[in-house]
Interface confidence: low
Amino acid sequence: SKWVFEHPETLYAWEGACVWIPCTYRALDGDLESFILFHNPEYNKNTSKFDGTRLYESTKDGKVPSEQKRVQFLGDKNKNCTLSIHPVHLNDSGQLGLRMESKTEKWMERIHLNVSERPFPPHIQLPPEIQESQEVTLTCLLNFSCYGYPIQLQWLLEGVPMRQAAVTSTSLTIKSVFTRSELKFSPQWSHHGKIVTCQLQDADGKFLSNDTVQLNVKHPPKKVTTVIQNPMPIREGDTVTLSCNYNSSNPSVTRYEWKPHGAWEEPSLGVLKIQNVGWDNTTIACAACNSWCSWASPVALNVQYAPRDVRVRKIKPLSEIHSGNSVSLQCDFSSSHPKEVQFFWEKNGRLLGKESQLNFDSISPEDAGSYSCWVNNSIGQTASKAWTLEVLYAPRRLRVSMSPGDQVMEGKSATLTCESDANPPVSHYTWFDWNNQSLPYHSQKLRLEPVKVQHSGAYWCQGTNSVGKGRSPLSTLTVYYSPETIGRR
C-alpha cells in the first residue's frame, strides 16, 4: 500500500532563480494533517524520525502561512503538493523530502533538485537533415520554468537576433518542467556553416547562458560559373581550357557536366580542354553536381576565325554578259569573326581592286577570264574558287584568208577562210562577191576548185552568232592564166 505521487523526477535551476515544483498526490486515508519539507532527509532509526534541514513546516490545521517565504507549499490537504522555492540557492541541490502525515499514515516522497552555480545552457535540437528553402523547426529546450522567474529564449544567427517569430511555450506540469522556443526557419544556402545561438535571457534581456550549433544546410552548388582560362581572343584551332567554378556546395561537388557534349578532354575535375576549337563552338556551359546539379549560364567562347565560304557572285546583269554591259561581281562570304574584313580582287595574279564589289562600266571581251577574290581579317585570309567571267560578243575582227595565197593559177584549188573572233563561236557564215552578191556557201571555208580566171575579184564574208553579225573587209583573189592557156593563145 502506497501513497500515489506525480511530479517531475528531477528539477533544474540555478543560483538566484527559483523552482516551481508541480505535484499531485493521493493519501491513503483522509486529509493531510502535517507536512514538512526536508532538505536531504535521513531516517534516524533510533528516533524513528527523519533528520535533515527543515525548509518548511505546516501548522497542524494545514493552513499556508500568509507571509511570503523563500519556500512555499502551495498545495492542499488532499491532492495538491505543489512547491515553490524563490530564490533557490546552490546549496539547495540534493533531495527534497516531502514528509506527509495523515491521521493514521505517513509517507516520505523524494524529489531531486539540481541547482547549478550559473544558469545552465539550453539545448538546441535540429532536424537530422536541413535543406535550403525547406522550412525547418529549430527547437531550443531548457529544462527550467518557474512562475517567479520569467526567462526568455532568443534566437541569434551569427550573433544577430533572428527576425522570424519564435513560439515560446512553457510546461509546468507534473509530467515535465521546461521552456521551449520553436523557430520556423527557411534556411538559405548562405546560412550553411553559420552559427545559430539560442540565448537564455532574464526578463530584462540580460544574458544568462546559451547553446550554439553550426548549421549544416544541404544545397546544390551555388554561383556556378564557367570560366575561360585562355588569353583572349580565342582563335579557331586553338586549345581552349575552361574551368567550372562555384561559390558554395554542400555536400561537396563530386562531378561536373558540360554542354554541349563533345569528344573533349577533362584533364582534371572541373576542367575541360577543347583541342582544335572549331569556329562554330559558340557557347559552353558547365554544371557542378553534388546530390543536385547546378548549371552555369553559358559562356561565349567568341572564337575568332578567318572569313568562311568565300565565293564570287555575279550580281549584274542577271542574265549572260554581253560585251558593253555594265557588270558587277560581289565577293561574298558566310561569316567572319572579327567582322572587320578587307577584300582583294585578282585576275591572273594581278590585283584589280579592294572593294567587296568589282564593277565594269562597259565590259569588253578582253575582260573575260578567271577571277578570284580574297577576304581577310585579323585572323587570316580566305580565297574564293576561281570564277570564269565569260563575255558574249558578236563576231569581230573578221578577215578572209586565202590559201595557198591571193594569187592562184587557173585550174588549181583556192580556199577562202572566214576567220573571226566571236563568243559564242560563229554559227552561220555568208559569203559575198565583189558585187555584194551572196554566194551559195555557208561554211567557214569557201573552196574554189578548179579555180577560173573569172573567179578573180574581191570577196568578203559575214559571220553570225547569237549576239549579232560581223563582216570582213574585202579580200582580192587574182586568178591568172596557166602557161597552157597562154600557149594556146
Epitope: Q152, Q154, P161, Q201, A203, D204
Partner: antibody, heavy 120, light 112 residues
Framework: QVQLQQSGPELVKPGASVKISCKAS????????MNWVKQRPGQGREWIGR????????NYSGKFKGKATLTADKSSSTAYMQLSSLTSVDSAVYFC?????????????WGAGTTVTVSS | DILMTQTPLSLPVSLGDQASISCRSS???????????LEWYLQKPGQSPKLLIY???NRFSGVPDRFSGSGSGTDFTLKISRVEAEDLGVYYC?????????FGGGTKVEIK
C-alpha cells in the same frame, strides 16, 4: 542609466530636408529596436517606424514611406531620422523611443523630443 | 491600419476619485505569438511620455499600484483607483501588435 539624447529644434524651409538624431547611452544600442513617433499639437501621436541598429532592418508606417528615412550608426550609438520634401504638415515634435524588452515589447525610455518647424 | 478609439476625450476628476479610461481597437490586437501588446502611456505637459502598463495589465516598474489595466480582444480599460495631483496629464493607449503601430487619440485627465 538608459538615456536617449535628441538633437535640438530645427527651423527649415518648405521643400527642404532635415535630419534629426537620437543618441543612446546606458545599454547595448544595437540590440533594441529604436522607434520614432510624431506628435502634432491637437493631433495625437503617430508611429513613424522603427530601426534595428544591429543590422539596419527597418519597418515604416505606410503613411511615412518616402517621407522618413531611418538610419543608425552603431559606432556612435546614434539613430537618425531624415525627413524630406518638408511641408507645413511636417511641423511637429518628433520623439525617439526604445523598445525596452525583446520579451514584452514596450517603449520604456523616450527622448525629450525634437521640434521641427517648417516655415518660409 | 488598426484604429484605436479612446473615450472620453476629456476626464475632469477630483483628487481621490477613481478614474476610468476606455480604449477600443478596430480589430483584435492579439499578436501571432499569443501576446496582446496593449500599452498605456502618460504624457505630462512639456515632458516625454512615460510607460504605465504593458501587455494589457502589467505595471511597469516604479508605477504605483493605483494604476491597473484590464481587457482583452478589442476592449481595454485603464483605471486609476485614487487620482493624485501627479496623475494629471494626457493618457494614450497604444497597440504594438500589428504594423503600423497606432496610438489612441488621448484622454486628458484634469481637475474639475
Amino acid at each position: 542609466q538608459v538615456q536617449l539624447q535628441q538633437s535640438g529644434p530645427e527651423l527649415v524651409k518648405p521643400g527642404a530636408s532635415v535630419k534629426i538624431s537620437c543618441k543612446a547611452s546606458g545599454y547595448e544600442f544595437s540590440r533594441s529596436w529604436m522607434n520614432w513617433v510624431k506628435q502634432r499639437p491637437g493631433q495625437g501621436r503617430e508611429w513613424i517606424g522603427r530601426i534595428y541598429p544591429g543590422d539596419g532592418d527597418t519597418n515604416y508606417s505606410g503613411k511615412f514611406k518616402g517621407k522618413a528615412t531611418l538610419t543608425a550608426d552603431k559606432s556612435s550609438s546614434t539613430a537618425y531620422m531624415q525627413l524630406s520634401s518638408l511641408t507645413s504638415v511636417d511641423s511637429a515634435v518628433y520623439f525617439c523611443a526604445r523598445d525596452g524588452s525583446s520579451w514584452d515589447w514596450y517603449f520604456d525610455v523616450w527622448g525629450a523630443g525634437t521640434t521641427v518647424t517648417v516655415s518660409s | 491600419d488598426i484604429l484605436m478609439t479612446q473615450t472620453p476625450l476629456s476626464l475632469p476628476v477630483s483628487l481621490g476619485d477613481q478614474a476610468s479610461i476606455s480604449c477600443r481597437s478596430s480589430q483584435s490586437i492579439v499578436h501571432s505569438n499569443g501576446n496582446t501588446f496593449l500599452e498605456w502611456y502618460l504624457q505630462k505637459p512639456g515632458q516625454s511620455p512615460k510607460l504605465l502598463i504593458y501587455k494589457v495589465s502589467n505595471r511597469f516598474s516604479g508605477v504605483p499600484d493605483r494604476f491597473s489595466g484590464s481587457g482583452s480582444g478589442t476592449d481595454f480599460t485603464l483605471k486609476i483607483s485614487r487620482v493624485e495631483a501627479e496623475d494629471l496629464g494626457v493618457y494614450y493607449c497604444f497597440q504594438g501588435s500589428q504594423f503600423p503601430y497606432t496610438f489612441g487619440g488621448g484622454t486628458k485627465v484634469e481637475i474639475k
